[in-house]
Interface confidence: low
């Protein structure tokens, strides 16, 4: 299998994640999911003991040479080797295709075959706990052991025959080598083919490294422990059928005595440490909706009680290539609208018994700021704004326009890039804010783009509450109140006085307060008051009044 990309740092789900347990695991830990065992979501593999050097070894009979250094052990695995590869191993390096569960050995060893080595054949039916290679079904010893030929001085003079027998568990060898030592001290080596039946290993030795997969039945809420052996073993009290121990209750220890006709007493006593029921754990998304665009929170929840020691339960998360040994993780400063993949597993006594993967898409982020192209008023009651939309996802726009302390907002379709504002007030400064928003887990508003314009001038409204009062025989006092709408930049009050169709006075004041003197007596006058805003006059307010006959 080709190497996969190795992302750095927290990556989105676009990056393939590395296996969660690819980092060194503690001794006695099952490696993460290289096997069909872990294609079942809630399986659980357990190695009950560490690899023993006695599991597969080269044994020398008690009659062997006194001087052990006389052996040339080149090509023969020593007793310290946790696993002796089969001759098939050297021909079939099929890493990654083995269907057995990887179990922890004393050093979590994974030994590859050495090319050209004289490998003692593995035992059919013996489960390899530390190798990724499949066991070859052929078991005869394919090479003979080699004695040192270079030094006869090292060998004491003896006349007895010494038989060196290589054993691997219950292998039955069909070849052996006999060394006859002559009285002169020289070694005469002859190879004969004889049928030797070595003593059987003890079942305790043979099954020292048995692995167990726990299969959970969600209906019965009971576990089945599957013993990973190739032969049909016998269990004390007939507790197993077809290498399976059924109806195991969560959080209870069960003892199984394992025997087989290929091994002798003592039997292997296997302690099954049953994990909690997998449905008692739930991977919960604990992300706050307000922050769901840039954060992810994942938390394992215990949704039911159990009697297992919670201190034996550990949690592991991997998101990208970041690994967390926490029950709850919070990832921050993420990209909005990105898929992030997090894998998680729960271990009981360092053995995985359930796992879950979540691909979480961060929520839509706040949209970007629209780019206003222009914003202006071309009439007294109208304005126009045009813009380019933001690049991030959004649902709609909100356009607000503020005049003085009044604020009006409109919801605009996402496809609009121009809006004509109607019914505006003349000669009024409008501040416009335009933002995009998206309705996600919560509504997120983008940054607002701002602009402003002042509408064109328009005629002001009428002055009001106009009064004309006589102050003397030939004098009048004219007053009025300002117009409600000035609609222009300036403020000036005008008074026109007419007699018949003749304009007799035209005055302009800052305030609407006029004193008209020296009028003719007993004359009808028309008084017209209006407001001028610098651009337009307003409609005049008209009152008629007559001077009296002179009292003198």
């Amino acid at each position: 299998q080709s190497p996969t990309p190795s992302p750095t740092g927290l990556t989105t789900a676009k990056m393939p994640s590395v296996p969660l347990s690819s980092d060194p695991l503690p001794t006695h830990t099952t490696a993460f999911s290289p096997a069909s065992t872990f294609e079942r979501e809630n399986d659980f593999s357990e190695t009950t003991t560490s690899l023993s050097p006695d599991n597969t070894s080269t044994q020398v009979s008690p009659d062997s040479l006194d001087n052990a250094s006389a052996f040339n052990t080149t090509g023969v695995s020593s007793v310290q080797t946790p696993h002796l590869p089969t001759h098939a191993d050297s021909q079939t390096p099929s890493a990654g295709t083995d269907t057995q569960t990887f179990s922890g050995s004393a050093a979590n060893a994974k030994l590859n075959p050495t090319p050209g080595s004289n490998a003692i054949s593995d035992v059919p039916g013996e489960r390899s706990t530390a190798s990724t290679f499949p066991t070859d079904p052929v078991s005869p010893l394919t090479t003979t052991l080699s004695l040192a030929h270079h030094s006869s001085a090292a060998l004491p003079a003896r006349t007895s025959n010494t038989t060196i027998t290589a054993n691997t568990s219950d292998a039955y060898l069909n070849a052996s080598e006999t060394t006859t030592l002559s009285p002169s001290g020289s070694a005469v080596i002859s190879t004969t083919t004889i049928a030797t039946t070595p003593s059987k290993p003890t079942c305790d030795e043979k099954y020292a490294n048995i692995t167990v997969d726990y299969l959970y039945n969600k209906e019965t809420k009971l576990f089945t422990a599957k013993l990973n052996v190739n032969e049909n073993v016998e269990c004390g009290n007939n507790t197993c059928t077809n290498n399976e121990v059924h109806n195991l209750t969560e959080c209870k220890n069960a003892s199984v005595s394992i025997s087989h006709n290929s091994c002798t007493a003592p039997d292997k006593t296997l302690i099954l440490d049953v994990p909690p029921g997998v449905e008692k754990f739930q991977l919960h998304d604990c992300t706050q909706v307000e922050k769901a665009d840039t954060t992810i929170c994942l938390k394992w929840k215990n949704i039911e009680t159990f009697t297992c020691d919670t201190q034996n339960i550990t949690y592991r998360f991997q998101c990208g290539n970041m690994i967390f040994d926490n029950k709850e993780i919070k990832l921050e400063n993420l990209e909005p609208e990105h898929e992030y993949k997090c894998d998680s597993e729960i271990l009981y006594n360092n053995h995985k018994f359930t796992n879950a993967s979540k691909i979480i898409k961060t929520d839509f982020g706040s949209p970007g700021e629209p780019q206003i192209i222009f914003c202006r008023s071309e009439a007294a009651h109208q304005g126009v704004i045009t813009w380019n939309p933001p690049q991030r996802s959004f649902h709609n726009f909100t356009l607000c326009y503020i005049k003085e302390t009044e604020k009006d907002c409109l919801n605009l379709d996402k496809n609009l890039i121009k809006y004509d504002l109607q019914n505006l007030k003349p000669y009024t400064k409008y501040v416009l804010s335009l933002h995009a928003y998206i309705i996600a887990k919560v509504q997120r508003n983008g940054s607002a783009a701002m602009c402003h314009f002042t509408t064109k001038s328009a005629p002001p409204s009428q002055v009001w509450n106009m009064t004309v009062s006589m102050t003397s025989d030939n004098s009048m006092h004219v007053k009025c109140r300002p117009p409600r709408d000035r609609n222009g930049p300036h403020e000036r009050y005008h008074l026109e006085v007419e007699a018949g169709n003749t304009l007799v006075r035209n005055e302009s004041h800052k305030n609407c307060d006029f004193r008209v003197k020296d009028l003719q007596y007993s004359t009808d006058y028309t008084f017209k008051a209006y407001f001028h805003n610098g651009d337009y006059p307003g409609e005049p307010f008209i009152l008629h009044h007559s001077t009296s006959y002179n009292s003198k």
């Epitope: 996969t4 994640s17 294609e39 079942r40 898929e339």
Partner: nanobody, 119 residues
Framework: EVQLVESGGGLVQAGGSLRLSCAAS????????MGWFRQAPGAERVVVAI???????YYVDSVKGRFTMSRDNSKNTVYLQMNSLKPEDTAVYYC?????????????WGQGTQVTVSS
């Protein structure tokens, strides 16, 4: 196990187009994540595009707007349409799958197809 076979690579001038195909056999891949990766000489294999089983597609920034990944579930095939090719797109292109309950990573790599973009 899924077997993947890529095809469609070749020599093309800068600005040209190619369409890569990845035919899957052994399993229907419609419900699995599929990815296109590439490996330039002397460099690591890197992701180009991923079609998630949920329907969304990811593109690395350098190919956004130029490359399009699609699926034809009836043919059990994924495609990578590559337009506006640049010399820096020269690499061996691989497709890969991430099945639900097997590896946590993309796996079942094909043999790859060479894409060479000349300037």
């Amino acid at each position: 196990e899924v077997q993947l076979v890529e095809s469609g690579g070749g020599l093309v001038q800068a600005g040209g187009s190619l369409r890569l195909s990845c035919a899957a056999s052994g399993r229907t891949v419609s419900r699995y994540d599929m990815g296109w990766f590439r490996q330039a000489p002397g460099a690591e294999r890197v992701v180009v595009a991923i079609s998630w089983s949920g329907g969304s597609t990811y593109y690395v920034d350098s190919v956004k707007g130029r490359f399009t990944m699609s699926r034809d579930n009836s043919k059990n095939t994924v495609y990578l349409q590559m337009n506006s090719l640049k010399p820096e797109d020269t690499a061996v292109y691989y497709c890969a799958v991430r099945t639900e309950r097997s590896s946590l990573d993309f796996h079942s790599w094909g043999q790859g197809t060479q894409v060479t973009v000349s300037s």
